[in-house]
């Protein structure tokens, strides 16, 4: 902790400028007041403050807001913002964009993803929900950090605004948040066509169910690999062999490369061997012609 | 990784002005950090000289301050240290350094360094 | 401005034997900054924030201390550490280094 002395009469700060870059530690701390320095936080950002200087800033605004900076004081953190701590972000009440936006430039380039995080959380609790605003900036200022949220969050976002969410968006983002952002998506892009809705829907897909796999198989959308190994494993191992060469199409030989790798390993254990030939590619590790399939899961359920 | 080359005359002589250039690759001198000069003198005791920062904004050691200058070139990523009125006590090795934090603080990445003497 | 002494200013030691140097300063710290130099070489970072390893360090390597006494520790003496050690901070402007500790091998 930084030790208290008094400020010597000719070190006494009336304004937060560029000569207390020369200050030592005790004596920004016996000389700065936090109540100047929360005023004039508008200027920190312009003024070359050392590291070791910035923990001295911090610890001023720490005592005199603890239970969390306001607003006015957030907005113009800049680089101070990477001194704070998830724990220190929690504490704020965040609802402005500019805000969210100015600390997502600042954070750029330095590993904060635990802060940034934090802060985005704040930002969809003080506004609410996640509105199309809120999507627009993320998508905008920080790719990829939509997937920073939690699907409790993510449950607030209305379908109406996945729109602006772009592939690239997602690129991060869980089973679990896929799973709460499908059926959003799915809403969506309902009135689309065919071939439009395949494309909206695909980086989403890694929250779609079985019948809807099934679905897509049916229409002729030559889903790509990637999309395909992204699919849930429980979605997938329902899936015939006669489904996934339709739901591939000429991509279906991509499944060789990927034979040792979930889903599609998984998936070739619960398959007939002899279905499995009639793809012609060589796929081991089906179930052998003869055996019979006990399904016991269900046995189970039904005693 | 980040890369950083000093240029310039090896001679100058005295009452002339020193100029070096620095030239950065693997980072953009616009990129948030605080790009420094700093100087080796023949007994190997290392000063700080100044900076110039990511935003352009410069701040000097004031030992220096009416001598020295430090600009940059955005378009070429290269960073400038022009000290005016040279005398023989600034014969140095003279290196340019970008610090490797978000404030000033430590001194990450190096130049070689280039030997300056200053002579008749 | 703060004023940096390091002590001693040569030193030998023998290959696996301990080594410590200290710096001292004019004025608290929060942060001390080490960097090793070997002739015709430009100054390398081996230690931030006083305790911690700069990338590409070996492990001998350590920093520790605070206020204004601060000591940087190579635990097992190899000959590829001979070289100069210089401390600094950036405490306040301007940034200041020691006068360095020349480290020989025995």
């Known amino acids: 902790d930084v030790e208290r002395t008094t400020c010597p009469p000719e070190k006494e700060v009336h304004e937060i400028d560029e000569s207390l870059i020369f200050y030592k530690k005790r004596e920004l701390e016996a000389c700065v007041d936090a109540a100047l320095l929360a005023a004039q936080m508008d200027r920190v950002d312009a003024i070359p403050f050392t590291y070791e200087q910035l923990d001295v800033l911090k610890h001023k605004l720490d005592e005199l807001y603890p239970q969390g900076y306001p607003e006015s004081v957030i907005r113009h953190l800049g680089h101070l913002f990477l001194k704070m701590s998830p724990e220190d972000i929690r504490k704020w009440n965040v609802t402005s964009l500019e805000t969210l936006k100015a600390l997502l430039k600042v954070s750029k380039g330095h590993e904060m993803s635990a802060q940034v995080a934090t802060l985005i959380d704040r930002v969809v609790v003080g506004r609410g929900q996640l509105d199309k605003d809120t999507v627009d900036t993320l998508t905008a200022f920080c790719p990829g950090c939509l997937c920073s949220l939690s699907p409790e969050r993510l449950s607030s976002v209305p379908p109406s605004v996945i729109g602006a969410v772009r592939p690239q968006d997602l690129d991060t983002c869980g089973p679990r948040q896929l799973d709460v952002l499908y059926p959003k998506a799915r809403l969506a892009f309902q009135n689309m066509s065919g071939s439009e809705y395949f494309v909206k829907i695909r980086p989403f897909l890694g929250g779609a169910p079985t019948e809807d796999v099934k679905a897509l198989s049916q229409q002729n959308v030559s889903m790509d690999l990637a999309t395909f190994m992204k699919l849930r494993r429980e979605a997938v191992l329902p899936l015939t062999v006669a489904e996934v060469q339709k739901l591939l199409g000429p991509h279906v030989e991509g499944l060789k490369v990927e034979e040792q790798h979930s889903p599609v390993r998984d998936w070739i254990l619960k398959q007939r061997q002899d279905d499995l030939d009639t793809l012609g590619l060589g796929l081991q590790g089906g179930i052998p012609n003869g055996y019979l399939i006990l399904d016991l899961s269900v046995r189970e359920a039904l005693s | 990784d980040v890369q950083l080359q000093e240029s310039g005359p090896g001679l100058v002589k005295p009452s002339q002005s020193l100029s070096l250039t620095c030239s950065v690759t693997g980072d953009s001198i616009t990129s948030g950090y605080y790009w420094n000069w700093i100087r080796q003198f023949p007994g190997n005791k290392l000063e700080w000289m100044g900076f110039?920062?990511?935003?352009?904004?410069?701040n000097y050691n004031p030992s220096l301050k009416n001598r020295i200058s430090i600009t940059r070139d955005t378009s070429k990523n290269q960073f400038f240290l022009k000290l005016n009125s040279v005398t023989t006590e600034d014969t140095a090795t003279y290196y340019c350094a970008r610090e490797g934090s978000y404030a000033p603080a430590w001194f990450a990445y190096w130049g070689q360094g280039t030997l300056v003497t200053v002579s008749a | 401005q703060i004023v940096l002494t390091q002590s001693p200013a040569i030193m030998s030691a023998s290959p696996g034997e301990k080594v410590t140097m200290t710096c001292s300063a004019s004025?608290?710290?929060?942060?001390m900054y080490w960097y090793q130099q070997k002739p015709g070489s430009s100054p390398r970072l081996l230690i931030y924030?006083?305790?911690n390893l700069a990338s590409g360090v070996p492990v001998r390597f350590s920093g520790s201390g605070s206020g204004t006494s601060y000591s940087l520790t190579i635990s097992r003496m190899e000959a590829e550490d001979a070289a100069t050690y210089y401390c600094q901070q950036w405490s306040s402007y301007p940034p200041t280094f020691g006068g360095g500790t020349k480290l020989e091998i025995k």
């Open positions: 004025s608290s710290l929060s942060y």
């Open positions: 110039i920062r990511f935003d352009g904004t410069n």
């Open positions: 924030d006083t305790s």
